[in-house]
Interface confidence: low
């Protein structure tokens, strides 16, 4: 009950992670134009990952995508990439954890199998969440190394007159919503994996196998690392001496290279 | 701080030429230079663009019109117009930008110089 209780969760907490990834990714206040210096400003900015925006005192707000000669930064690509990243893992591990669920009976599927997509789509969320947070925070890291210099068009009136204004820009919404949502889809992800653990079949942990000395003493060994998971058991009984003769002691007491399979 | 002055602007017939320039006044050069217009109840759109490296950005419809032209020395940018149509008619702003490291570059513009072309 409480494996299930413990996907369920993990599953909801991811869902609502990815949901805000999804959202600081498209969200326009990524920065924000800092109104430290002049509170009662006509216009107020804010820049987006797609496109830059202007709102004016009069409830006026126009959005343009960047226009540029130069190209975007190389920075501002790889904060799309990872965010874009980010959901696309997100949401691929949504689609496994639905099947992976343990109150949804798919045919005949196996604890083992719903345990392995448990796990990798607990992986998946992991890596999703640390995609969003790393993206954030490199935006987030060029809004502080850059906060004195940073520019930005400000239209003024509909007619779309132009003037340029030093604007220093600070955190926006989104930044606050991507750390937010990459820290619960990590989370999420974390749970799904602990999941995983409870919902392994359960094999007993001394699985015995019998290894034959040509000696009149014989020496059991456990199945080793693979016998006490539930992903694979070591079923054939495997020689580990090589039925020379040897004392009890020398059988026991002196480990092999081999004692490991 | 830079400043943009736009000059050559007027009035032309169909099929006239003009030529506009544009001096940016300061202590940095810029890495892009352009020329965007405004129609009357248009967004601005850009006509013809250079950027440091010298490769060049044209509008569709002024292709094999227009020809932008750069002088690094003087920073200064010039769009000779040929060709001209009734449709070419906007305010036409001198823009400028420099890249700086930040996510956006920084933009610079002019107040604009108005062209007519008319009959």
């Known amino acids: 009950m409480a494996v299930t209780a413990c996907q369920g969760l993990g599953f909801v907490v991811s869902l609502i992670g990815i949901a805000g990834i999804i959202a600081a990714t498209c969200m326009d206040q990524w920065s924000t134009q800092d109104l430290y210096n002049n509170p009662v400003t006509a216009v107020f900015n804010y820049q987006g990952l797609w496109r830059s925006c202007v709102r004016e005192s009069s409830g006026f707000t126009e959005c343009r995508g960047y226009f540029t000669l130069l190209g975007l930064p190389a920075m501002l690509q790889a904060v799309r990439a990872l965010m874009i990243v980010g959901i696309v893992l997100g949401a691929i591990g949504l689609l496994v954890s639905i099947f992976a669920l343990k109150c949804i009976r798919i045919g005949s599927m196996e604890d083992s199998a719903k345990a392995n997509m448990t796990l990798t789509s607990g992986i998946m969320f992991i890596v999703s969440g640390l995609c969003a947070i790393a993206g954030v925070s490199v935006f987030a890291n060029m809004l502080v190394t850059n906060f004195w210099m940073s520019t930005a068009n400000m239209y003024t009136g509909m007619g779309g007159m132009v003037q340029t204004v030093q604007t220093r820009y600070t955190f926006g919404a989104a930044l606050f919503v991507g750390w937010v949502a990459g820290g619960l889809t990590l989370i999420g992800g974390v749970m799904m994996c602990i999941a995983c653990r409870g919902l392994a079949p359960e094999e007993t942990n001394y699985k015995a196998v019998s290894y034959h000395a040509s000696g009149h003493s014989v020496a059991y060994k456990p199945g080793g690392f693979k016998a006490s998971t539930g992903f694979g058991s070591n079923t054939k009984n495997k020689k580990i001496y090589d039925g020379g003769a040897r004392t009890e002691d020398e059988v026991q007491s002196y480990p092999s290279k081999h004692d490991y399979v | 701080q830079l400043q943009l002055v736009e000059s050559g602007g007027g009035l032309v017939q169909p099929g006239g030429s003009l030529r506009l320039s544009c001096a940016a006044s300061?202590?940095?050069?810029?890495?892009?230079m352009a020329w965007y217009r405004q129609a009357p109840g248009k967004q601005r759109e850009l006509v013809a663009g250079m950027t440091r490296g010298g490769s060049t950005n044209y509008a569709d419809s002024v292709k094999g019109r227009f020809t932008i032209s750069r002088d690094f020395a003087k920073n200064t940018v010039d769009l000779q117009m040929n060709s001209l149509k009734p449709e070419d008619t906007a305010v036409y702003y001198c823009n400028a930008e420099i890249y700086t490291g930040t996510f956006y570059p920084r933009s610079y513009w002019g107040q604009g110089t108005q062209v007519t072309v008319s009959s």
């Open positions: 300061g202590e940095i050069s810029s890495d892009a």
